[in-house]
């Protein structure tokens, strides 16, 4: 019960994680207008991975494309290619997840079979969610650094009586809702990988039995040497149900999800 | 078609307080933003404040402690109020729809004439 | 706040003639973000109240004739009357659009011989 339940909620929030990852890739608010220096601006700017907009107090809004492709930033190019990647990956993982859920009976798939889905979906959670969280880092440390470029030199003119206010970027929405989505994404993947192992099939846990040669009583068990090796499945602690092995301790600790705020 | 029109009191007394009602039709308040524009007798425009679609409001710095600019979306009116007035805030008070886009003035009211004097 | 020097007060001109004034900002009006001046011009003929002639420096609002022609960028605009008509005596005003309060400029009175 424990691990369908850890599988199910590795996938549900890896399914919100992955929302998240293509809503923030979507969002225009991934660098906003610093108003720190001019807070009585009438016109408000933002930009995000595929355009670029301007909010006037009226709420008017007006977005420009990033019509060029060899125009922009590197950094902005791999930060495309890091999201777009996070998706794809993402949405490969959540197909794969579907099928290896336990809850579904797809004809007569092994668990073994479904136990190996669960593993592959988890790491590819895992790598989506890095893959977004590293993207969103990448976009946030190309803000602060030319943040300061620009802070460095704020004003210039001529003579001084002319001033140009040179616009700074700070820190927009989606890099918050990009790096909450990437962990979710994370975190799912790491339950299904949990999961993955309550899933995989144990060694057939066999009842003691006697077998009686002439001269002597030989207790005989299957796998005790494995057993008693260390190698293969371990019976210690295990009771013995007609659909397999589990564990007594296997209760799953789930990390709580923080609301950025 | 889109109409503007200012009714005031014509003469206040110093110290006392203004308010001008611009009625407004062919268009709604909840889309466009209005702004309040003196012109002193002879002299040229004074930009007071405007209150935009969703209420917010922006004042001149300089008159921002004895001005309110307020509005009723469903009577299609907005009111300005201004406190303490004296004799230099005699003039011709205009209020103007917001172009949306360019943060224009694009339709103005005939203007009303506010005389400070006692 | 952003003061608006316009340049000359006022012009005398014969009928025909081409018009340029100037409007002149301490800080730049040109938002980067859409590469766009947000400066005004408004013409007023006695009596009545401004009339808006162009908006972002050089749009032309709609019903202006087209001898009316705005240009200029950051801190330093210009409005040209191409061929001037009796009409078209009246103040000129630029307005600074992008940061409040939207100041207007003193104004430039266009006046016939």
């Known amino acids: 019960m424990a691990v369908t339940a850890c599988q199910g909620l590795g996938f549900v929030v890896s399914l919100i994680g992955i929302a998240g990852i293509i809503a923030a890739t979507c969002m225009d608010q991934w660098s906003t207008q610093d108003l720190y220096n001019n807070p009585v601006t009438a016109v408000f700017n933002y930009q995000g991975l595929w355009r670029s907009c301007v909010r006037e107090s009226s709420g008017f809004t007006e977005c420009r494309g990033y019509f060029t492709l060899l125009g922009l930033p590197a950094m902005l190019q791999a930060v495309r290619a890091l999201m777009i990647v996070g998706i794809v990956l993402g949405a490969i993982g959540l197909l794969v997840s579907i099928f290896a859920l336990k809850c579904i009976r797809i004809g007569s798939m092994e668990d073994s079979a479904k136990a190996n889905m669960t593993l592959t979906s988890g790491i590819m959670f895992i790598v989506s969610g890095l893959c977004a969280i590293a993207g969103v880092s990448v976009f946030a440390n190309m803000l602060v650094t030319n943040f300061w470029m620009s802070t460095a030199n704020m004003y210039t003119g001529m003579g001084g009586m002319v001033q140009t206010v040179q616009t700074r970027y700070t820190f927009g929405a989606a890099l918050f809702v990009g790096w909450v989505a990437g962990g979710l994404t994370l975190i799912g993947g790491v339950m299904m990988c949990i999961a993955c192992r309550g899933l995989a099939p144990e060694e057939t846990n066999y009842k003691a039995v006697s077998y009686h040669a002439s001269g002597h009583s030989v207790a005989y068990k299957p796998g005790g040497f494995k057993a008693s090796t260390g190698f293969g499945s371990n019976t210690k602690n295990k009771k013995i149900y007609d659909g397999g092995a589990r564990t007594e301790d296997e209760v799953q600790s789930y990390p709580s999800k923080h609301d950025y705020v | 078609q889109v109409q503007l029109k200012e009714s005031g009191p014509g003469l206040v007394a110093p110290s006392q307080s203004l308010s001008i009602t611009c009625t407004v039709s062919?268009?709604?308040?909840?889309?466009?933003?209005v702004h309040w524009v003196r012109q002193p007798p002879g002299k040229g425009l004074e930009w007071l404040g405007v209150?935009?679609?969703?209420?917010?409001?922006n004042y001149n710095s300089a008159l921002m402690s004895r001005l309110s600019i307020s509005k009723d979306n469903s009577k299609s009116q907005v009111f300005l109020k201004m406190n303490s007035l004296q004799t230099y805030d005699t003039a011709m008070y205009y209020c103007?729809?917001?172009?949306?886009?360019?943060?224009?003035?694009?339709?103005w009211g005939q203007g009303t004439s506010v005389t400070v004097s006692s | 706040d952003i003061v608006m020097t316009q340049s000359p007060s006022s012009l005398t001109v014969t009928a025909g003639e081409k018009v340029t004034m100037n409007c002149r900002s301490i800080?730049?009006?040109?938002?980067?973000?859409?590469?766009?001046?947000?400066l005004s011009w408004y013409q007023q003929k006695p009596g009545q109240p401004p009339k808006l002639l162009i908006y972002w420096a050089s749009t032309r609002e709609s019903g202006v004739p087209d001898r009316f022609t705005g240009s200029g960028s950051g801190t330093d605009f210009t409005l040209t009357i191409r061929s001037v008509l009796d009409e078209d005596l009246a103040v000129y005003y630029c307005q600074n659009s992008y940061s409040y309060p939207f100041t207007f400029g003193s104004g430039t009175k266009l006046e016939m011989k």
């Open positions: 800080q730049s009006l040109l938002n980067s973000g859409n590469q766009k001046n947000y």
């Open positions: 062919g268009f709604s308040l909840i889309s466009y933003g």
């Open positions: 209150i935009w679609a969703g209420g917010r409001t």
């Open positions: 103007a729809r917001d172009r949306y886009g360019g943060n224009s003035l694009d339709y």
